[in-house]
């Protein structure tokens, strides 16, 4: 089978600070040395890129400085964290993995993680 399987949790609840973390694991059909991981958000039929990072196997993921994502890698497993989430960001987040090098190229698409975000209640004014 030439398909690459990607596994990710079905549901994750973001913290009260708007942070959500989940693991994206892929079954590599080959010995990849350079991997690109992309987090996509699917709303209705629209798919948008949330963040992306390319890393060499054995090294850390490097997201752009202004990215809302951070992550670490260990073998064929990537631990992803998305920050700054608000209730309106609730949705399906898909982990996409591409084995860029060496040939052949492989694409893996996860089934998506439904991330639920609940905005914290504002603190009531105190009478002190």
């Amino acid at each position: 089978c030439k398909a690459m399987h990607v596994a990710q949790p079905a549901v994750v609840l973001a913290s009260s600070r708007g942070i959500a973390s989940f693991v994206c694991e892929y079954a590599s059909p080959g010995k990849a040395t350079e991997v690109r991981v992309t987090v996509l958000r699917q709303a209705d039929s629209q798919v948008t890129e949330v963040c992306a990072a390319t890393y060499m196997m054995g090294n850390e993921l490097t997201f752009l400085d202004d990215s809302i994502c951070t992550g670490t890698s260990s073998g064929n497993q990537v631990n992803l964290t998305i920050q700054g989430l608000r209730a309106m960001d609730t949705g399906l987040y898909i982990c996409k993995v591409e084995l860029m090098y060496p040939p052949p190229y492989y694409l893996g698409i996860g089934n998506g993680t439904q991330i639920y975000v609940i905005d914290p209640e504002p603190c009531p004014d105190s009478d002190f």
Partner: antibody, heavy 118, light 108 residues
């Protein structure tokens, strides 16, 4: 408007060279992989070449390996295909196509005709 | 290389009828990585179905895809005049990216 527009096709003699261009607009070009696909007259679709987001990784069909070179300029939102040592069997309409976020080729140009004949 | 074989090569159908197109892969293709395209004469291909069964944006619901592993199907439930065209399947899960040879759907 989200679109791809190819240019650079034409008539060239066997052994000659041609450079195709594909101008992208209406989307963040650097966030997508890109491909060239060709179609010989009356025939089916044949994938030709792939280039990664930053242009670091390139793949080619065996039929063009060593003769064609794919490249991109993200600052100019442009994709290129340098075709050398052209053969009669390279005669085709050449399409540039965007590799969608989920993988399929979700946006195609209108195509540019390349004819290799003496 | 994954070879995709489409059948039949030509399908003659009357408008309003159902059309069923087949695509068979030489080895297993994950269902997330199989697409169908429509091409009309003188035009570029247009994405219809991706992930074996998901309709692309703007594609009418008379088009549906199914299948997994090595056998995939594109079904057009009621053929409209504008549906007469050539249809290609494609796998995009690994390089080299490959297309089937196409099925021409013509008016009976």
């Amino acid at each position: 408007e989200v679109q791809l527009v190819e240019s650079g096709g034409g008539l060239v003699k066997p052994g000659g060279s041609l450079r195709l261009s594909c101008a992208a607009s209406g989307f963040t070009f650097s966030s997508y992989t890109m491909h060239w696909v060709r179609q010989a007259p009356g025939k089916g679709l044949e994938w030709v070449s792939f280039i990664s987001y930053d242009g670091n990784y390139k793949y080619y069909a065996d039929s063009v390996k060593g003769r064609f070179t794919i490249s991109r300029d993200n600052a100019k939102n442009s994709l290129y295909l340098q075709m050398n040592s052209l053969r009669a069997e390279d005669t085709a309409v050449y399409y540039c196509a965007r590799g969608g976020h989920l993988g399929p080729f979700d946006l195609w140009g209108q195509g540019t005709m390349v004819t290799v004949s003496s | 290389e994954i070879v995709l074989t489409q059948s039949p090569a030509t399908l003659s159908v009357s408008p309003g009828e159902r059309a069923t197109l087949s695509c068979r892969a030489s080895q297993s293709v994950g269902s997330s990585y199989l697409a169908w395209y429509q091409q009309k004469p003188g035009q570029a291909p247009r994405l219809l179905i991706y992930g074996a069964s998901s309709r692309a944006t703007g594609i009418p619901d008379r088009f549906s895809g199914s299948g997994s592993g090595t056998d995939f199907t594109l079904t057009i439930s009621r053929l409209e005049p504008e549906d007469f065209a050539v249809y290609y399947c494609q796998q995009y899960g690994s390089s080299p990216w490959t297309f089937g040879q196409g099925t021409k759907v013509e008016i009976k």
